[in-house]
């Protein structure tokens, strides 16, 4: 005859407050006879949770039918769970006596612990926008977990990173713990589009992890290059000139035409392009009145990109004689 | 819900034997010890022994010995309690009972069989 | 035989009345284990006796917090705070610390 063992499989059960919790036991035989009771604690002062010939256990159900015979599962259920819940349960055999039974073995007992699911992690990003090739830190903060055990990862765009740094508080016993991460990432010129995720894995979320995200959009900025080019072709007496505003971000822009250092007011057509990766383009056109003009003429297209220094661009016009005589032809 | 349903009123000759059931449901009756007691009319409660159905293992009250046999079936959920050599001061009611060494007592009751021995 | 002298025999009262019963034993009822295996029991008429009170003073599943049991070695008391309707009937003292069993004589407790 195999001799009896009482299996608790969960060392530890992590519960939340208002649920069920499951405390399993089974035993391997069914001698010797006698009844298997839930304790809470061990030694003279340990709390009777379940007996099945007590009536007074109105949260306690067992998870099979006691009564039949050959039944070897002495699980049972705790609903509505609480803090006085926590503590550490164990199923007891005992062998039938008289004039009273007789401990026979004990489970290795299952501890029961409130456990807290993380609250939704929350990114923050910098406070200011950076150019591609500078770093920037991200925080990631989620509060109210219990254990404290937790796994926290960094990705951006699926790669996870590894320069961050985390700190869970408190170090010592609480009800509920906080975690603080803070990622250091490289800008790349293309990552307008690109995100940052903070990861949070706890034994609470049964491995359905809690993300954060960030859009490194409000991170980045992605300064535009300027090329200015005259239309080999003239319109009449006007020369069209391009200044092309390439591959920026945010798209907050404004551009000015300058004529020999004069500003010009009038209206210039332009349109907004937005690339594959997010960025900007911006092409702005400017007619030349030459039929007047002299031969030095110098045209500068000046943008100002998200309330950063001005860029500019200059361009020497060049207007042949022969161009002259056309407008002069063209002229009544 | 734990129930000992017990066999009904009999009425014997004096010298004559009978034997009485007492069959539980709710439990298995090799988790508890089967108590027979007697109360005759107006009297107070006599201890007749008791019976363990696990084992078939026995004990008697020393006035009993001879006069009562316990037997139990684990198969049926019966006990059994046979008296013999029946005479008048063996008219009561009699009473199975499981013992559960929880308690230490005897916490569950039949309702009783009653036996009236005539001459 | 450990016999069980449980006084009075009986004990006539107005509902509401605490009551109570004392039930001495000729030799204490402390066990090997340190357990007392002394037992109170009602028995209302045309009924099987009901455990009420096991181990001296645990009361059993179901039964009102008006009923306690008090005692040690040889001495024990059941005591009824409020008597109840549903109360009346004959109480018995039980010990199994020794073998054979062995019940008191009974108190009935009945309205005056």
């Known amino acids: 005859e195999e001799e009896l063992q009482m299996i608790q499989p969960e060392k530890l059960l992590l519960v939340t407050v208002g649920k069920t919790a499951t405390l399993h036991c089974t035993v391997t035989s069914l001698l010797p006879v006698g009844p298997v009771l839930w304790f809470r604690g061990v030694g003279p002062g340990r709390e009777l949770i379940y007996n099945q010939k007590e009536g007074h256990f109105p949260r306690v159900t067992t998870v099979s039918d006691l009564t039949k015979r050959n039944n070897m599962d002495f699980s049972i259920r705790i609903s509505s769970i609480t803090p006085a819940d926590v503590g550490t349960y164990y199923c007891v055999k005992f062998r039938k006596g008289s004039p009273e039974n007789v401990e026979f073995k004990s489970g290795p007992g299952t501890e029961m612990a409130l456990g807290a699911k993380p609250s939704a992690p929350v990114v923050l990003g910098p406070a200011a926008r950076t150019t591609p090739e500078h770093t920037v830190s991200f925080t990631c903060e989620s509060h109210g977990f219990s254990p404290r055990d937790i796994t926290l990862k960094w990705f951006k765009n699926g790669n996870e990173l590894s320069d961050f740094q985390t700190n869970v508080d408190p170090t010592g016993q609480s009800v509920a713990y906080s975690i603080r991460s803070t990622a250091r990432v490289v800008l790349d010129p293309w990552d307008v589009r690109s995100q940052v995720i903070c990861e949070v894995a706890h034994v609470t979320l049964q491995g359905d992890p809690l993300r954060g995200t960030a859009n490194l959009s409000e991170a980045i900025r992605v300064p535009p290059t300027l090329e200015v080019t005259q239309q080999p072709m003239r319109v009449g007496n006007q020369v069209n000139v391009t200044c092309q505003v390439r591959k920026f971000y945010p798209q907050s822009l404004q551009l000015t035409w300058s004529e020999n250092g004069n500003v010009c007011q009038r209206e210039t057509a332009s349109t907004l392009t937005e690339n594959k990766d997010g960025t900007y383009n911006w092409t702005s056109w400017f007619l030349v009145n030459i039929s007047d003009q002299r031969d030095d003429v110098v045209l500068t297209c000046q943008v100002k990109h998200d309330g950063q220094l001005a860029v500019s661009k200059r361009l020497a016009l060049e207007v042949t004689v022969h161009q002259k005589d056309q407008s002069s032809d063209a002229t009544p | 819900e734990v129930q000992l349903q017990q066999s009904g009123t009999e009425l014997v000759r004096s010298g004559a034997s009978v034997k009485l059931s007492c069959t539980t449901s709710?439990?298995?009756?090799?988790?508890?010890?089967m108590h027979w007691v007697k109360q005759r009319p107006e009297q107070g409660l006599e201890w007749i022994g008791w019976i363990d159905p696990e084992n078939g293992d026995t004990e008697y009250a020393p006035k009993f010995q001879g006069k009562a046999t316990m037997t139990a079936d684990t198969s049926s959920n019966t006990a059994y309690l046979q008296l013999s050599s029946l005479t008048s001061e063996d008219t009561a009611v009699y009473y199975c009972?499981?013992?559960?060494?929880?308690?230490?007592?005897?916490?569950?009751w039949g309702q009783g069989t009653s036996v009236t021995v005539s001459s | 035989d450990v016999v069980m002298p449980q006084t009075p025999l009986s004990l006539p009262v107005s509902l509401g009345d605490q009551a109570s019963i004392s039930c001495r034993s000729s030799?204490?009822?402390?066990?090997?284990?340190?357990?007392?295996?002394l037992h109170w029991y009602l028995q209302k008429p045309g009924q099987s006796p009901k455990l009420l009170i096991y181990?001296?003073?645990n009361r059993f599943s179901g039964v009102p917090d008006r009923f306690s049991g008090s005692g040690s070695g040889t001495d024990f008391t059941l005591k009824i705070s409020r008597v109840e309707a549903e109360d009346l009937g004959v109480y018995f003292c039980?010990?199994?610390?020794?073998?054979?069993?062995?019940f008191g004589a009974g108190t009935k407790l009945e309205l005056k």
């Open positions: 039980s010990q199994n610390t020794h073998v054979p069993l062995t």
């Open positions: 181990k001296v003073s």
């Open positions: 030799q204490s009822l402390v066990h090997s284990n340190g357990n007392t295996y």
């Open positions: 709710g439990f298995n009756i090799k988790d508890y010890y």
């Open positions: 009972n499981a013992y559960d060494g929880y308690y230490g007592a005897m916490d569950y």
